[in-house]
């Protein structure tokens, strides 16, 4: 399956935090999307092979790594001045 | 910042099997990306030999697989290249060679490289 | 085997000149992802080669601004704007879209 954690995370102001994605499902594909709320999914960034990543439409404040197929964090950044949402990881084939 | 280094005989007698061995810095081979072999006969162009990947994995160059074995020594964050049967021909510098972050498979960090003479 | 074809293999050129180096892959380099991982590398004499750019036209830390690259498919070009003294040396293209991983034969910049 796939694994997300931590399920809830506080920030302090002018912090970097991460938040883990594993999937042991051997896809290649996987994605970090942000819910706002009353808002749809918004695609922030996703990475279809190991060590290539492209940035999706929010990207701005974000950072991600893709170092083996099973993982795929996203590191909020002190950037990012409004990070409170839900965020989702997702993987495909 | 990723550092390799190549180490092992310069001098092989063909039909012997040569082996190097890559010692990586600053990064963990088991922390992910892939390790890779390349290497440059005298005056001649790059060939890419294969690699390991982070989870022990191999790919390997059509062309030299039936010779070519790369494995690793987690312990000592190193992986090593052997070749078989060598012949004149196998007369190169040999790299070990690694991807930089978000860049695929393309490789940027290099050892200096080590030349290996194959000679009787 | 995907064959990368550069063009020329050598080339005289001054400093100041815009020098344009081809590459020709023998199958198309776009991946399953969409992404296109053709790459070029400098290389001096005993020196490990240096990465220049990745995925075309993406130009790698540090790499000064008068090299780009561009192209699609299997047709591609390096481009140098303005040579300067350090750009002597040894260009190749290399592709990482189908194993096994290939380079070019090589391009040689020589001064005029």
């Known amino acids: 399956g796939i694994t997300q954690s931590p399920k809830y995370l506080f920030r302090k102001e002018g912090q970097n935090v991460t938040l883990s994605c594993e999937q042991n499902l051997n896809h290649d594909a996987m994605y970090w999307y942000r819910q706002d709320p009353g808002q749809g999914l918004r695609l922030i960034y996703y990475s279809q092979i190991v060590n290539d990543f492209q940035k999706g439409d929010i990207a701005e404040g974000y950072s991600v790594s893709r170092e083996k197929k099973e993982s795929f964090p996203l590191t909020v950044t002190s950037a990012q001045k409004n990070p409170t949402a839900f965020y989702l990881c997702a993987s495909s084939i | 910042q990723v550092q390799l280094q190549e180490s092992g005989p310069g001098l092989v007698k063909p039909s012997e099997t040569l082996s190097l061995t890559c010692t990586v810095s600053?990064?963990?081979?088991?922390?992910?990306?892939?390790w890779n072999w390349i290497r440059q006969p005298p005056g001649k162009g790059l060939e890419w030999i294969g690699y390991?990947?982070?989870?022990?994995?191999?790919n390997y160059n059509p062309s030299l697989k039936s010779r070519v074995t790369i494995s690793r020594d987690t312990s000592k964050n190193q992986f090593s290249l052997k070749l078989s049967s060598v012949t004149a021909a196998d007369t190169a510098v040999y790299y070990c060679a690694s991807p930089s972050p978000g860049t695929g498979y393309a490789v940027d960090y290099w050892g200096q490289g080590t030349l290996v003479t194959v000679s009787s | 085997d995907i064959q990368m074809t550069q063009s020329p293999s050598s080339l005289s050129a001054s400093v100041g000149d815009r020098v344009t180096i081809t590459c020709r892959s023998s199958?198309?380099?776009?991946?399953?992802?969409?992404?296109?991982?053709l790459h070029w590398y400098q290389q001096k004499p005993g020196k490990a080669p240096k990465f220049l750019i990745y995925k075309v036209s993406n130009r790698f830390s540090g790499v000064p601004s008068r090299f780009s690259g561009s192209g699609s498919g299997t047709d591609f070009t390096l481009t140098i704007s303005s040579l300067q003294p350090e750009d002597f040396a040894t260009y190749y293209c290399?592709?990482?879209?189908?194993?096994?991983?290939?380079f070019g034969q090589g391009t040689k910049l020589e001064i005029k």
């Open positions: 390991i990947s982070y989870d022990g994995s191999n």
């Open positions: 600053g990064y963990s081979i088991t922390s992910g990306y892939f």
């Open positions: 199958q198309s380099l776009v991946h399953s992802s969409g992404n296109t991982y």
């Open positions: 290399s592709q990482s879209t189908h194993v096994p991983f290939t």
